[in-house]
């Protein structure tokens, strides 16, 4: 089923720090703390401040924008090129308008506009351009090779006309929080299985710590119960299979974990937690991605 | 047992059109990512198009973008990819893959694709 | 032009170690997972390595993978006639959001 809105409290929509999952369909109760079975493994690297823990913040680059609405000054700073994650409930779009320009379109400064079903390069007529994402989430990446140059946001979100998502979907922001797999009530549809989406600020990667139980037997066909975590933007896959305790790094600051309906109809179990994580290498900001014809 | 299966190969003038499919016989094809990718004669690989599971993201190879287009269907556990204004330095051999970065990473056996007049 | 680049040939002795390199840069090797794949003439490639060091089930150990910065390494130990082949590395590469391969290399048993 298409399921309902989710309604996240503003509080916690727009709150730093660790969140915990609402089902697309669900009360808000399901999304109460629950207790960890076990601490996480070993941070490998220092857990990433959330942009929203630092009070005072000297560039736009690299947040994530939770609140409902906002505005985002993405003008003169001071990198080439410069990301920024905005996030809603499932069941909620994103909608962006241009307040001011200076990209200089001639020099190839650009304005991408990438998410799911979206993928839009943009540089010229954008003032007052107004656009709204297919879904709950938006990256939003300014290149821009003039220091002072750039652009000024206004976003907002309301109710998705249509919705992608699965009435037992979930959705974590932030830059950790704890993850527990559904448990669906005999009334629930779990068609296709669920799925939990998982994003953090841009540049970061997600590390994922958990323990998988009762998951039965079965591997193919179906009825199988395993559990895929994706990498969204770089499409790799990693699929579990059986009982265990399973670590998980992604490329890019997107994944989405999916347990499948074999998973659900065994009643099995996954609780553990996501955290982020620096690149492995620092990047050159020197993308290459900006080539091809506007409006792509 | 995963069997991807091209086809829809076959010679084409420059600047025509082709659209090749790849079936998979499995139980997975919906979990995965699908790519295709390509390898002309007596060269190595290169990749050309890529489809999230659920075919909401899409990415293209420089070469390709805005003449290929990656699509799929679930229901049919089918990929495909619409080629158009055909150049002859697409000819090569056609594969598709399977969660092609993953250990769940299957090809088929490929199908060539000429580009002559 | 390759973005991620691997040397044309190596050549080793029956029963001695190869290794084959792929070198790139921040935006592919050095901040994604590098795979490894096996080709034989007239065949589909098959995976050998994933993950930077993971292995395929039904993949002996003698194939092994390796990652330092923006560089990976595939060693094949115990080289047997068999492993004539072409070997290409492939990652994922942030800034073209694609998918690139190295040029591949042959590796022939004397």
């Known amino acids: 089923g298409q399921g309902t809105p989710s309604l996240v409290p503003h509080e916690e929509a727009a709150a730093p720090g660790r969140t915990t999952a609402t089902p697309a369909g669900a009360s808000l109760e399901w999304s109460q703390a629950r207790g960890l079975l076990f601490s996480p493994a070993p941070q490998p690297r220092r857990l990433l401040p959330g942009p929203q823990e630092n009070s005072v913040q000297s560039s736009a680059c690299g947040r994530q924008h939770l609140e409902p609405t906002g505005t985002i000054d993405m003008r003169g700073p001071g990198q080439a090129d410069c990301a920024v994650a905005i996030g809603r409930p499932l069941g909620e779009v994103v909608t962006l308008r241009v307040l001011e320009s200076s990209l200089n379109c001639s020099a190839g400064d650009m304005l991408l506009l990438w998410g799911r079903l979206t993928w839009r390069k943009m540089c010229r007529k954008l003032l007052d351009m107004t656009f709204s994402s297919k879904t709950n989430t938006l990256v939003v990446r300014q290149r821009c090779g003039r220091p002072g140059g750039g652009v000024l946001l206004r976003y907002g979100s309301q109710l998705a006309p249509e919705t992608f998502y699965r009435e037992c979907d979930m959705q974590l922001f932030g830059p950790w929080g704890e993850i527990v797999s559904p448990s669906l009530s005999p009334a629930t549809s779990n068609a296709g299985g669920c799925r939990l989406f998982i994003n953090v600020a841009p540049h970061a990667r997600i590390a994922i710590h958990a323990l998988a139980t009762n998951m039965g037997a079965g591997t193919e066909g179906a009825n199988a119960s395993y559990i895929l975590i994706r990498d969204t933007h770089s499409l790799r896959t990693t699929a579990f299979h059986g009982q265990q305790v399973l670590y998980w790094e992604s490329e890019s600051s997107q994944a989405e974990m999916e347990f499948s309906e074999g998973f659900l109809k065994a009643q099995a179990s996954l609780r553990g937690q996501y955290w982020t994580l620096q690149s492995w290498v620092p990047e050159m900001q020197d993308p290459q991605s900006w080539k091809g014809k506007e409006g792509t | 047992q995963v069997q991807l299966q091209e086809s829809g190969g076959g010679v084409v003038q420059p600047g025509r059109s082709l659209r090749l499919s790849c079936t998979d016989s499995?139980?997975?094809?919906?979990?995965?990512?699908m790519h295709w990718v390509r390898q002309a004669p007596g060269k190595g690989l290169e990749w050309v198009a890529g489809i999230s599971y659920d075919g909401s993201y899409e990415y293209y190879a420089d070469s390709v973008k805005g003449r290929f287009t990656i699509s799929r269907d679930n229901s049919k556990n089918t990929l495909y990819v619409q080629m158009n204004s055909l150049r002859g330095e697409d000819t090569a051999v056609y594969y598709c893959?399977?969660?092609?970065?993953?250990?769940?990473?299957?090809w088929g056996q490929g199908t060539l694709v000429t580009v002559s007049s | 032009e390759l973005v991620v680049t691997q040397p044309p040939s190596v050549s080793a002795a029956p029963g001695q170690k190869v290794t084959i390199s792929c070198s790139g840069s921040?935006?592919?090797?050095?901040?994604?997972?590098v795979s490894w794949y096996q080709q034989f003439p007239g065949t589909a490639p098959k995976l050998l390595i994933y993950d930077n060091n993971k292995r395929p089930s039904g993949i002996p150990d003698r194939f092994s993978g390796s990652k330092s910065g923006t560089s990976a390494t595939l060693g094949i130990t115990g080289l047997q006639t068999g492993d004539e082949a072409d070997y290409y590395c492939?990652?994922?590469?942030?800034?073209?959001?694609?998918?690139?391969f190295g040029g591949g290399t042959k590796v022939t048993v004397l």
């Open positions: 499995g139980f997975t094809f919906s979990r995965y990512a």
């Open positions: 492939g990652t994922w590469d942030s800034s073209l959001s694609a998918v690139v």
């Open positions: 921040t935006s592919n090797i050095g901040n994604n997972y």
């Open positions: 893959a399977r969660d092609l970065r993953g250990g769940e990473d299957y």
